[in-house]
């Protein structure tokens, strides 16, 4: 998917206002000194990817997050602020059920969602920089 | 079973104001968007407003922006459309529904609809 | 925003006719586009989804294509029942639009 249309300034304030904090509260009792950020991305729909990618892809050692709190509200923001997002998710939303994992918030997955919070950062400032 | 419920609806004079409701049961209130629309008698359906309890965000049609607020009562599972200054144009059957935000992406419910009369 | 034109805006046909009805967006929106149908007095009722993907209780004799900018609502056979509007939607981008209905009246 292309994120290059994508309405930025409301993805923005859905991040701000509740994504962010789901994210936080997912990283409870970790340090933002705990884990290198490794991940990076250079523009908003680049961010937008990245996050994407993160977020719903499944890895080897972290295949929950897509049923986390802040996954459902990402992919929501994305569906109605991104045009044509919501189709392309018909058939992953499909997939997904199919292979409904047990919930295990492992270290690798602490590691991936730091990584989230650095991307949505980067995302913020490169509106900023915009604007 | 899913069930929206509208009411509120009435006869008003023009320059007045109206809130409509929407009572939504039988399913999960976050996991939707509600959405206003609208229909004038005898004429096409005009999409008015929505609301995404997930994200706590709303959006309008730039038609009705500044005249008409979404509002909603998460305890009740309760959606409000607050109409302001209202014209004999937006004499309408108002209609809610509701739309997966994480799935499905499609108005697949809707209720009875209230009608609105705004006439002097 | 996106404008739907539907075609046409009304239609007379007999009971066991083929009817296909076509939305038109003013740009290219995938497969975004959903169709509806409605009775006098009642709400509309959702027939076909995403251009082409059937909804569980809907007879299949309406069935959907389409992809980019034409799109196309098709009853193999009339039924007595099928007698209402028709309308299109998009959910493309915000704000939602719908197409004007077409009106499918007994011949």
């Known amino acids: 998917y292309d994120f290059t249309n994508c309405d930025f300034q409301k993805i923005e304030a859905d991040y701000l206002r509740t994504i962010s904090k789901d994210l936080i509260t997912y990283m409870s009792g970790t340090k933002s000194t705990d884990f290198n950020n490794t991940v990076s991305c250079s523009n908003r729909p680049h961010c937008l990817t990245e996050i994407q990618s993160l977020t719903f892809n499944p890895t080897p050692r972290c295949a929950s997050l897509a049923k986390e709190m802040f996954a459902r509200k990402t992919k929501a923001t994305l569906a109605l602020w991104c045009p044509g997002y919501s189709e392309t998710q018909i058939n992953a939303t499909q997939a997904m059920k199919k292979r409904r994992k047990r919930k295990v918030t492992t270290n690798k997955c602490l590691e991936q969602v730091s990584q989230l919070l650095g991307l949505w950062r980067r995302f913020i400032r490169t509106l900023l920089k915009k604007q | 079973q899913v069930q929206l419920v509208e009411s509120g609806g009435g006869v008003v004079q023009p320059g007045r104001s109206l809130r409509l409701s929407c009572a939504a049961s039988?399913?999960?209130?976050?996991?939707?968007?509600m959405h206003w629309v609208r229909q004038a008698p005898g004429k096409g359906l005009e999409w008015v407003a929505t609301f995404i309890p997930l994200l706590d965000t709303s959006d309008y049609n730039q038609n009705f922006k500044g005249r008409f607020t979404i509002s909603r009562d998460n305890s009740k599972n309760t959606l409000y459309l607050q109409m302001n200054s209202l014209r004999a144009e937006d004499t309408a059957v108002y209609y809610c529904?509701?739309?997966?935000?994480?799935?499905?992406?499609?108005?697949?419910?809707w209720g009875q609809g209230t009608l609105v009369t705004v006439s002097s | 925003d996106i404008q739907m034109t539907q075609s046409p805006s009304s239609l007379s046909a007999s009971v066991g006719d083929r009817v296909t009805i076509t939305c038109r967006a003013s740009?290219?929106?995938?497969?975004?586009v959903h169709w509806y149908q409605q009775k006098p007095g009642k709400a509309p009722k959702l027939l076909i989804y995403f251009a082409s993907q059937s909804i569980s209780g809907v007879p299949s004799r309406f069935s959907g294509s389409g992809s980019g900018t034409d799109f196309t609502l098709t009853i193999s056979s009339l039924q007595p029942e099928d007698f209402a509007t028709y309308y299109c939607?998009?959910?493309?981008?915000?704000?939602?639009?719908f197409g004007q209905g077409t009106k499918v009246e007994i011949k």
């Open positions: 039988g399913y999960i209130f976050t996991d939707y968007a």
């Open positions: 939607q998009q959910t493309f981008s915000l704000p939602y639009t």
């Open positions: 740009q290219p929106i995938s497969i975004s």
């Open positions: 529904a509701r739309m997966g935000v994480t799935h499905s992406y499609v108005m697949d419910a």
